[in-house]
Interface confidence: low
Amino acid sequence: ARNGDDCPLGPGRCCRLHTVRASLEDLGWADWVLSPREVQVTMCIGACPSQFRAANMHAQIKTSLHRLKPDTVPAPCCVPASYNPMVLIQKTDTGVSLQTYDDLLAKDCHCI
Amino acid sequence: ARNGDDCPLGPGRCCRLHTVRASLEDLGWADWVLSPREVQVTMCIGACPSQFRAANMHAQIKTSLHRLKPDTVPAPCCVPASYNPMVLIQKTDTGVSLQTYDDLLAKDCHCI
């Protein structure tokens, strides 16, 4: 792991990209998507300890205030920093269409 | 209030903008910032129940998978959708300088 990404909570426990296999039924898409029948959903999961992958100044502030007021201010949260596009084959009234979604699969993660 | 933003958990408990007053000491900035002495930090706090202020398709997927696999997939998280700039008067070797930070104060919030 890169130095700045060393997780103080143990390997793999901090904010990082995970893949979760999901069927169209799992996603509630069975009635409008034809293909793929299964999606490898990449998402951001894990803890955001002090300054770990801090996205910006706001994340740094949040860390400081969370330390002071843990009941009021939550810790930063692990969310996508960017996305990979995905093409879905959708059902339409007239047949099928190809639609590209730019905000469906996480590409990399940070804490905010 | 807009229909899509009705919080099923009760008023004010879902993802929304909150203001937390913080001193330079609270933020750990006392040694490099001269002014302001106190900051009204706007940040995104609150729960993200099903489809509440979902930022994008990824957030919708996350909600569906969290329902199915709550131990594996976390619920969406309340984070800034955009920021307000803030000017800090900073100490420098030669005196002071004005620096604008574009990513310091949350302007509005969504769930992702």
Epitope: - | G10, G12, L17, P36
Partner: antibody
């Protein structure tokens, strides 16, 4: 339509307490915070605090924190504001107001007001 | 607490006039500002929030503008029912505070 109906005028002596009620109708009471504001000729409009009727959580203006208590009765959709240790400068019109769902401290519907006079 | 200062404190105008009321915050409140209208013996009524969004049912002759510390409420063509007192209020953190009011009177 949204309606907030407040209790009648009160005349109190210094040192006493007053409890003002605010009955809500025309919307789901537990879906919106209730704010309390007062208005006096000397100090203008002052925000006292708010209460979340769903779980009773309160948020007070520091100025009133030690003397004001906000409560609700969900069964009657009624909010209450009690102010203790009254002084002559507490003479004012007290309003309850529904807080807009998305924005803290933004009051979209107001009660008609309750005049509280503090005099010996 | 954030101080809100309105000007003028009173204003005389005629039906049909264009009127502007200003409000200044003691610190940057971005767009977190509301305007209320109050008639004698009545409760305040929400007109504008987030500096420029008209509340439900408010006539389009009312408009709000500004951000940061300086804000204005404009009535493009005064109607008889507009003569009242107007208050600004910041929506930026606790406690929300109000301006001292601007009384709009018939000339």
């Amino acid at each position: 339509q949204v309606q907030l109906v407040q209790s009648g005028s009160e005349l109190k002596k210094p040192g006493a307490s007053v409890k003002v009620s605010c009955k809500a109708s025309g919307y789901t009471f537990t879906d919106y915070n209730m704010d309390w504001i007062r208005q006096s000729p000397g100090k203008g409009l002052e925000w006292i605090g708010d209460i979340n009727p769903n779980q009773g959580g309160t948020f007070y203006n520091q100025k009133f924190k030690d003397r004001a208590t906000l409560t609700v009765d969900k069964s009657t959709s009624t909010a209450y504001m009690e102010l203790r240790s009254l002084r002559s400068d507490d003479t004012a019109v007290y309003y309850c107001a529904r807080e807009e769902k998305l924005y803290f401290g933004l009051m979209d519907y107001w009660g008609q007001g309750t005049t509280v006079t503090v005099s010996s | 607490d954030i101080q809100m200062t309105q000007s003028p404190s009173s204003l005389s105008a005629s039906v049909g006039d264009r009127v502007t009321i200003t409000c200044r915050a003691s610190e940057n409140i971005y767009s977190y500002l509301a305007w209320y209208q109050q008639k004698p013996g009545k409760a305040p009524k929400l007109l504008v929030y987030n500096a420029k969004t008209l509340a439900e049912g408010v006539p389009s002759r009312f408009s709000g503008s500004g951000s940061g510390i300086d804000f204005t409420l404009t009535i493009s063509s005064l109607q008889p029912e507009d003569f009242a007192t107007y208050y600004c209020q910041h929506q930026y953190g606790s406690p929300p505070t109000f301006g001292q009011g601007t009384k709009l009177e018939i000339k």
